[in-house]
C-alpha cells in the first residue's frame, strides 16, 4: 500500500495557560530528506491552516517566528505544541504531513485530535 | 470566492514554446498546492505538474519532465506554465488547479486550449 | 503510478433511476486520498466526493461515495436531468495523480 498514515491522539486538554501538546507520529512508504508538517483546524465543513513548518530529516522543524505553533521531530515522530489557545479555539486540529523530497511526493492525514481548551477563571479581588 | 482564471492558450508548431499563466484570488495563494491537468480533445483527464506552497517543491508527469516547468509568484498570486519542445499529443485543454489543505482538487479554473500543429 | 479503472465505460439509464459507478485501483489506496469529480461538455470538472465518501460543499446528497482498498463505488441514488455527465475517479496520495478513464452517464 503506497498510502502514508499518521497517527494522533483523539482527545487533548490545554493547559489553564491555553497551551496544547500532541504527538503527531507518521509511517513513511519512501525515503524522504523534506518533510512538511502542518496543523490544520475542522471548524464544520470548513478547514483552516492553523501553521505549517517543513524540516530536513534530522534537523528540527522551524515554524515562522509569528507562529502559535513549536515542535520538535525525532525520526518519523512530531512533538507539536499549539499555544495562546483560549475556549473559542476548542475543536479538531488535524495533522497533515507530505513527504515533500526526494519524488514521489506522499499526503499523510491523520484523524484530528480533539483539543478543548478551557478559559480559566478569573482570580477574585482579595480584601487583604 | 476563489477564482483561477487561465490564460496564455493558442496555436503552436510541434517544437515550439508557449507559457500559460494563471491568476489566483480569494484566497491565500502560498498555503495551497497548485497544479496544472490537462484533457485532450474527447479524452479523460491527465495530472500534469504540481508546484508547492513556497515553490521550493515540484512534481511532474514523466510525459512531460524535461520538456515544462511550473513556477509559481506568490507575491503576484500567479501560476505559471512553460511548455517547451510542444508535441501533437500536448493538444489539450489545460487547467489551473488548487489543491485543497487536505489534498483534493476543489478549485478550477475555466481552461485555456493549447494546440500544437503544422 | 496508480493505476485507476472505471466501470462501465457508458452508462445509459433513465431520470430517476439509480446509477452505480465503479473505480478500482491498480494498488490499495487509502480512502482518505480518493475523490470523485462531474464533468459536463464544455465545462471544468467540478468535485463532488473526496475521502472516498465526504461530499463537497453544495452537493445534494443523492450522491454518496463508498470504497476502500482498490474498490470504490459512486452511487446516484435517484438521477437527475442534470446528472447526465462524464464522472472521473482520482488518487491524491502520492504523485503522479491519477485520474480513472471516466465513466458517461447518459440518457437511455
Known amino acids: 500500500c503506497k498510502a502514508m498514515h499518521v497517527a494522533q491522539p483523539a482527545v487533548v486538554l490545554a493547559s489553564s495557560r491555553g497551551i496544547a501538546s500532541f504527538v503527531c507520529e507518521y509511517a513513511s512508504p519512501g525515503k524522504a530528506t523534506e518533510v512538511r508538517v502542518t496543523v490544520l483546524r475542522q471548524a464544520d465543513s470548513q478547514v483552516t491552516e492553523v501553521c505549517a513548518a517543513t524540516y530536513m530529516m534530522g534537523n528540527e522543524l522551524t515554524f515562522l517566528d509569528d507562529s502559535i505553533c513549536t515542535g520538535t521531530s525525532s525520526g518519523n515522530q512530531v512533538n507539536l505544541t499549539i499555544q495562546g489557545l483560549r475556549a473559542m479555539d476548542t475543536g479538531l486540529y488535524i495533522c497533515k504531513v507530505e513527504l515533500m523530497y526526494p519524488p514521489p511526493y506522499y499526503l499523510g492525514i491523520g484523524n484530528g485530535t480533539q483539543i478543548y481548551v478551557i478559559d480559566p477563571e478569573p482570580c477574585p479581588d482579595s480584601d487583604f | 470566492q476563489v477564482q483561477l482564471v487561465e490564460s496564455g492558450g493558442g496555436v503552436v508548431q510541434p517544437g515550439g514554446s508557449l507559457r500559460l499563466s494563471c491568476a489566483a484570488s480569494?484566497?491565500?495563494?502560498?498555503?495551497?498546492?497548485m497544479h496544472w491537468v490537462r484533457q485532450a480533445p474527447g479524452k479523460g483527464l491527465e495530472w500534469v505538474t504540481v508546484?508547492?506552497?513556497?515553490?521550493?517543491?515540484?512534481h511532474y508527469a514523466d510525459s512531460v519532465k524535461g520538456r515544462f516547468t511550473i513556477s509559481r509568484d506568490n507575491s503576484k498570486n500567479t501560476l505559471y506554465l512553460q511548455m517547451n519542445s510542444l508535441r501533437a499529443e500536448d493538444t489539450a485543454v489545460y487547467y489551473c488547479?488548487?489543491?485543497?489543505?487536505?489534498?483534493?482538487?476543489?478549485?478550477w479554473g475555466q481552461g485555456t486550449l493549447v494546440t500544437v500543429s503544422s | 503510478e496508480i493505476v485507476l479503472t472505471q466501470s462501465p465505460g457508458t452508462l445509459s439509464l433513465s431520470p430517476g433511476e439509480r446509477a452505480t459507478l465503479s473505480c478500482r485501483a491498480s494498488?490499495?489506496?487509502?480512502?482518505?486520498?480518493l475523490a470523485w469529480y462531474q464533468q459536463k461538455p464544455g465545462q471544468a470538472p467540478r468535485l463532488l466526493i473526496y475521502?472516498?465518501?465526504s461530499r463537497a460543499t453544495g452537493i445534494p446528497d443523492r450522491f454518496s461515495g463508498s470504497g476502500s482498498g482498490t474498490d470504490f463505488t459512486l452511487t446516484i441514488s435517484r438521477l437527475e436531468p442534470e446528472d447526465f455527465a462524464v464522472y472521473y475517479c482520482?488518487?491524491?496520495?502520492?504523485?503522479?495523480?491519477?485520474f480513472g478513464p471516466g465513466t458517461k452517464v447518459d440518457i437511455k
Open positions: 494498488q490499495s489506496v487509502s480512502s482518505s486520498y
Open positions: 480569494g484566497f491565500t495563494f502560498s498555503s495551497y498546492g
Open positions: 488547479v488548487r489543491g485543497e489543505l487536505l489534498g483534493y482538487f476543489d478549485n
Open positions: 475521502g472516498a465518501s
Open positions: 482520482q488518487q491524491y496520495g502520492t504523485s503522479p495523480f491519477t
Open positions: 508546484m508547492w506552497y513556497d515553490g521550493s517543491n515540484k
